[in-house]
């Protein structure tokens, strides 16, 4: 069981605007309220981030570290999915994504994991300490979940600084001890406070984002050494609960696509979506629903009247090709 | 309190047929992986089968890829493991399981049926 | 297939003494993904540990489990009479999912 704060690795600065410190500024401030705490294993990381521009807004971004074939995503918030959290989007790699509200846009961003945004107005509308949950569903590793949170004090000044550290794999968990990753954080955040102070204020532009090509194991944290803690979920208490959901399932077992029709399964292929990372030939465990069940040993879904799905042409295993030997 | 039933078993013929069921209580089944482990007269275990929650996704060992079907109705609660063509080697406890979330699998399990598969 | 080998297949131990028991896996397993079970005669198996070294729900604390790679043991500080029973280790690092065979501890 560990315990970890984690913010991402800072990108290098764009050539273009170091002089006026652009991305730098754009940054900053992003980092800074950027928190979580991840509690329950080493195979799901959770990031929770409020977003700078829209202080009520919210993504939460999940990762699998596994190698398994993903049959599942569930994001939940108040708690774990099974014990009172309440389903924010399901994630499903062949038949698309369904979302409730407060949730904007669910989407995968690779084959292991997913980001999730959060409306920020409205009665339903997250606070800063409510819990976030990811689970996913793999196999043959299983079912795992882990939660994330802003602290209750979310102030851009309490928020823990950055790590530069490369990214980690939970494996490696012992290499960096916090105290060192967050004391070569404030030294760098300082560093960059410095150079800011000493810089005539840069006009504001229009942030003008490029997409990235999405990244495999991106985000993963680099972990705290392994806490002998054996507590299933830092589940922080919230004042803020969320509005009930008009949730299709509401004891986790996601019947939605279950009677989906088999035409709604396929989601497009986006344009080149996901040339840019090859997707690894999976065992014969995998089952890509429909066409390929003999390889899995699984059955056609039953057709029928299903519910509207909201295809993601940047789905991560959307058609994919011939499966090779594990 | 998680309580999961097996039934079904008995004494059949080679190359038979056998359906066995799991009837799960104390926690709400459709939410929950269920899978099939049996024990061998040598008390080897062996992994046959898994089912995920919404039931669409399966899982089978290769020695019974074929021969055997999971399935499951939420609606009961119920699990079954439909087996063909059955072997001598088949002869075992059958155990129904559940997972749990960071557990793995096998986190619970019924109290088994015996399937004898004799001549 | 990852094969898991315990050793050794069958032991004895008296009130009191410390015991080890190993599980080795034919290739790396993660640690996550590594568990033991309790069976003991006319009882269906338990998850005893889960994770390498997490220890389930009602287990006391004198048992603990470690391990990493293809290495993993469970080990017992204090064996005491209910201690007696077979354990079985278990990965589902990759599919099919296998169990050793399990070592029969007995009390001396």
């Known amino acids: 069981m560990r315990t970890e704060a984690q913010v991402p690795a800072l990108q290098p600065p764009e050539p273009g605007l170091e002089g006026a410190m652009g991305h730098r500024t754009l940054v900053l401030p992003w980092v800074l309220l950027t928190l979580c705490v991840t509690a329950g294993t080493p195979e799901v990381w959770v990031q929770v981030r409020m977003e700078a521009t829209e202080l009520s807004s919210f993504t939460i971004r999940c990762g699998f570290l596994g190698s398994g074939s993903i049959s599942l995503v569930t994001v939940s918030w108040g708690g774990p999915n099974g014990a009172g959290g309440t389903t924010l989007a399901v994630l499903h790699p062949e038949r698309g994504i369904r979302q409730w509200a407060p949730a904007r846009q669910a989407r995968w961003e690779t084959q292991s994991s997913i980001s999730l945004i959060l409306e920020g107005s409205g009665a339903s509308s997250p606070c800063a300490n409510t819990t976030f949950c990811c689970k996913f569903a793999s196999f043959p590793e299983g079912s795992w979940e882990a939660c994330g949170s802003l602290p209750p004090s979310s102030d851009p000044g309490l928020s823990a600084p950055p790590t530069p550290a490369p990214i980690l794999r939970a494996d490696l968990a012992g290499i960096l001890g916090v105290s060192g990753v967050l004391l070569f954080g404030c030294v760098y955040l300082l560093h960059l406070l410095r150079r800011h102070k000493h810089r005539p204020a840069p006009r504001l532009q229009p942030s003008r984002t490029s997409p990235q090509a999405p990244r495999a194991r991106a985000w993963a944290p680099s972990q705290a050494s392994q806490a002998a803690l054996h507590v299933p979920y830092a589940t922080i208490n919230t004042s803020c609960r969320p509005a009930t959901l008009d949730t299709a399932h509401p004891h986790g077992g996601p019947s939605w696509w279950a009677s989906l029709p088999t035409h709604a399964a396929h989601r497009p292929q986006g344009p080149a979506a996901w040339a840019s990372t090859p997707i690894p030939a999976r065992g014969s465990f995998v089952s890509v629903e429909n066409g390929l069940y003999a390889q899995a040993g699984e059955r056609p879904p039953h057709t029928g009247p299903g519910l509207t799905l909201f295809p993601d042409p940047r789905g991560p295993r959307a058609m994919e090709g011939p499966l090779g030997v594990r | 309190e998680v309580q999961l039933v097996e039934s079904g078993g008995g004494l059949v013929k080679p190359g038979g047929s056998l359906k066995l069921s799991c009837a799960a209580s104390?926690?709400?089944?459709?939410?929950?992986?269920l899978s099939w482990v049996r024990q061998t007269p040598e008390k080897r275990l062996e992994w046959v089968a898994t089912?995920?929650?919404?039931?669409?996704?399966?899982y089978y060992s290769d020695n019974e890829k074929g021969r055997f079907t999971i399935s499951r109705d939420n609606a009961k609660n119920n699990l079954y493991l439909q087996m063909s063509h059955l072997k001598s080697e088949d002869t075992a406890i059958y155990y129904c399981?559940?997972?749990?979330?960071?557990?793995?699998?096998?986190?619970?399990w019924g109290q088994g049926t015996l399937v004898t598969v004799s001549a | 297939q990852v094969i898991l080998t315990q050793s050794p297949a069958i032991m004895s131990a008296s009130l009191g003494e410390r015991v080890t028991m190993t599980c080795s896996a034919s290739?790396?397993?993660?640690?996550?993904?590594f568990h033991w079970f309790q069976q003991k005669p006319g009882s269906s198996p338990k998850l005893w540990i889960y994770s390498t070294s997490n220890l389930a729900s009602g287990v006391p604390p004198r048992f603990s489990g470690s391990g990493s790679g293809t290495s993993y043991s469970l080990t017992i500080s204090s064996m005491e009479a209910e201690d007696a029973a077979t354990y079985y280790c278990?990965?589902?690092?990759?599919?099919?999912?296998?169990f050793g065979a399990g070592t029969k501890l007995e009390l001396k």
């Open positions: 089912i995920r929650d919404g039931g669409s996704y399966t």
């Open positions: 104390g926690f709400t089944f459709s939410g929950y992986a």
């Open positions: 278990h990965q589902h690092h990759r599919s099919p999912l296998t």
């Open positions: 290739s790396s397993v993660s640690s996550s993904y």
């Open positions: 399981t559940r997972d749990q979330v960071n557990r793995g699998w096998f986190t619970y």
